[in-house]
Amino acid sequence: SAHAHPRDSCPLGPGRCCHLETVQATLEDLGWSDWVLSPRQLQLSMCVGECPHLYRSANTHAQIKARLHGLQPDKVPAPCCVPSSYTPVVLMHRTDSGVSLQTYDDLVARGCHCA
Amino acid sequence: SAHAHPRDSCPLGPGRCCHLETVQATLEDLGWSDWVLSPRQLQLSMCVGECPHLYRSANTHAQIKARLHGLQPDKVPAPCCVPSSYTPVVLMHRTDSGVSLQTYDDLVARGCHCA
């Protein structure tokens, strides 16, 4: 097809475009100190940065969105940087019956793209 | 668990929060006039609007992001409005050997959430 291909080089300069960044957060930051027991400090990988035209387009829809944003910036928003995949996280937390270890699949980003 | 639940009422007023909106686009708008033959006008559903705290959170990661954005707005971006699902679209387009009908699964948004 004649679809435009997503590009991976950032035209805005280093660190400006959509990428994964680690944010340190405590259970207090997250409001979780009443139910999560461990880990007490979390390494939260999040997606940050801008999505210039066709940069890391998630799919055809994102390419269309980028194109239409160029034509109608007031009506169509630019694509934005969101997780493309996640890393499982094991939390030790309270339950009604005691304490449990549970894996959460949608908590920490592993990769990012522009959607 | 003690996770905050995503909320569905928009605190910003009607039409301001993340929702699905239809945008009319021609093949020329999309740069597709040289390879797509039909339809010549597309009804493109896109996700637009803001993502206030916990509005239509996609998952736990989005809830965390909303919380940390409140604490560190310069470092952590707010969640943004992106497709949660897509509607398949059939396009008639040129191929090397003639004309083909093809279904595209990631072209038009069907639902939106804040990620």
């Epitope: 680690t22 100190s33 009443d34 027991l37 461990s38 880990p39 007490r40 400090q41 979390l42 390494q43 990988s45 890393t87 499982p88 996280v89 094991v90 939390l91 030790m92 304490v99 270890l101 894996t103 908590l107 920490v108 592993r110 | -």
Partner: antibody, heavy 119, light 112 residues
Framework: QVQLQESGPGLVKPSQTLSLTCTVS??????????WTWIRQHPGKGLEWIGA???????YYNPSLKSRVTISVDTSKNQFSLKLSSVTAADTAVYYC???????????WGQGTLVTVSS | DIVMTQSPLSLPVTPGEPASISCRSS???????????LDWYLQKPGQSPQLLIY???NRASGVPDRFSGSGSGTDFTLKISRVEAEDVGVYYC?????????FGGGTKVEIK
């Protein structure tokens, strides 16, 4: 079922660097909340926490060993490694790798490998 | 670092009888969330340590219910309600409240 296996030389000369690798099987090393840990046990003695690493590469070291320890992770090989520099006879020990939730709950351990520091 | 002290050093036991090991920390292990950050491990002869109890009183997966942990603050106890021959080995307490985690010196449990 997660399994851990230490590997590396059993004999290291004084002043050299001790290098051990722990291979994780039966599960991914790339999980948040998990600290991949090194613990040692001097002959006939108790246990000493050396340090740990998260899948992201963040490291945590025992202050008593910090100046000599480096722990690294290779997610593509599902392995993490320990390097202990400038070893002396006092570093002779059985070295264990283990999986913990942060600094606790070491629920999976390697079988341990004896490293002797001697010329 | 938090210092962990175990007693007794050695504990001869009779199969079928109860046994008790004490562990004391140099500062309170009680977190503001109400949990005591203390683990218990058993190292059987020639084996790696195995987790018995975490957060003071929670039995790890697969651990028989004859093992129980109790205590709060600075004083903790591991109890075996009825000792079996397979329970012999060295028992360690470990504080997990703050880094570095530190272990007690161990209590050797052996059959009389």
């Amino acid at each position: 079922q997660v399994q851990l296996q230490e590997s590396g030389p059993g004999l290291v000369k004084p002043s050299q660097t001790l290098s051990l690798t722990c291979t994780v099987s039966g599960g991914s090393i790339s999980s948040g909340g998990i600290y991949w840990t090194w613990i040692r046990q001097h002959p006939g003695k108790g246990l000493e926490w050396i340090g740990a690493i998260a899948y992201s590469g963040s490291t945590y070291y025992n202050p008593s060993l910090k100046s000599r320890v480096t722990i690294s992770v290779d997610t593509s090989k599902n392995q993490f490694s320990l390097k202990l520099s400038s070893v002396t006879a006092a570093d002779t020990a059985v070295y264990y790798c283990a999986r913990g939730i942060e600094y606790q709950h070491f629920d999976y351990w390697g079988q341990g490998t004896l490293v002797t520091v001697s010329s | 670092d938090i210092v962990m002290t175990q007693s007794p050093l050695s504990l001869p036991v009779t199969p079928g009888e109860p046994a008790s090991i004490s562990c004391r920390s140099s500062q309170s292990l009680l977190h503001s969330n109400g949990y005591n950050y203390l683990d218990w491990y058993l190292q059987k002869p020639g084996q790696s340590p195995q987790l018995l109890i975490y957060l003071g009183s929670n039995r790890a997966s697969g651990v028989p219910d004859r093992f129980s942990g109790s205590g709060s603050g600075t004083d903790f106890t591991l109890k075996i309600s009825r000792v079996e021959a397979e329970d012999v080995g060295v028992y360690y307490c470990m504080q997990t409240l703050e880094a570095p985690p530190t272990f007690g010196g161990g209590t050797k449990v052996e059959i009389k």
